[in-house]
Amino acid sequence: ELCDDDPPEIPHATFKAMAYKEGTMLNCECKRGFRRIKSGSLYMLCTGNSSHSSWDNQCQCTSSATRNTTKQVTPQPEEQKERKTTEMQSPMQPVDQASLPGHCREPPPWENEATERIYHFVVGQMVYYQCVQGYRALHRGPAESVCKMTHGKTRWTQPQLICTGEMETSQFPGEEKPQASPEGRPESETSCLVTTTDFQIQTEMAATMETSIFTTEYQ
């Protein structure tokens, strides 16, 4: 089940997913002057079985002026550099290996990809928040949000993060110096599809991952 809304917006913060649950879809978007090839996929889909998850379909962009020629999928260094630096993309990561069962890792860039990725998240997805450069994180609780299903409707939990305008950048889970003792989750809620294991595994993964994969939905 797709989440109805996008993760909550926190002033002066961006979010990222460490891994993507099976069922997640990523738009095949091209940068200005390029377009998706006519026969090409609209989306990539995170799919798999109990032991292996990978992204189905490949995104391909072609010059808007040349409608019938297909560009190669392997990204060139110039195209990789054009991606927003805040996204911290890691093209070295193999697309067919996920750190978690039932999850896909960040797909590598494709040639002439748009600068921002548009994801369609599914219930159970967790995203982590980080203050943008020049802002410092004040924590009242977990700086994360989970898409939950309650009473037949999906919603994202509210991340307990405030970004203050001090010239100090914050790091990601496991590297941050908490400003106060984190409280428990502000709401006690029953989740239809999110389990404690999801929280534990993803939090552990967030704390131990060496390479940050930073992505945001289209803002």
């Epitope: 809304d5 996008d6 879809m25 978007e29 989306y43 369609h120 803002q219």
Partner: nanobody, 126 residues
């Protein structure tokens, strides 16, 4: 020239229904994602629903899910938004939008849509 023309707006009592249509010319709907947005007086434009031409993804804002239904007739180059159980807070100008790529939804999702209609007013009285 691309044109999207909305129709079907009007005044309705709370709990009532209304059906909006969006007629497209100058583009073929069968290779465009179609969406509906709305804007209430003094508020920002808000995403309502979107559906791609392949019916792979259909997205709704949580505020309308279960009450509104987006559909499309690719052959007739027309999109629809059926609105049931209307509430006073649904009062707004409703806009039809289209884009070549996949569905884009969310708070500030209007930017990626290439084509827009002029809008149709929907007023829901208490």
């Amino acid at each position: 020239e691309v044109q999207l023309v909305e129709s079907g707006g009007g005044l309705v009592q709370a709990g009532g229904s209304l059906g909006l249509s969006c007629a497209a010319s100058g583009i073929t709907f069968n290779d465009h994602t179609m969406a509906w947005f709305r804007q209430a007086p003094g508020k920002e434009r808000e995403f309502v629903a979107a559906r791609d031409w392949s019916d792979i993804i259909t997205r709704y804002a949580s505020s309308v899910k279960g009450r509104f239904t987006i559909s499309r007739d690719n052959a007739g180059n027309t999109g629809f938004l059926q609105m049931n159980s209307l509430r006073p807070e649904d009062t707004a100008v409703y806009y039809c939008a289209a884009r070549e790529g996949g569905v884009v939804a969310g708070v500030r999702s209007g930017a990626p849509y290439d084509y827009w209609g002029q809008g149709t007013q929907v007023t829901v009285s208490p």
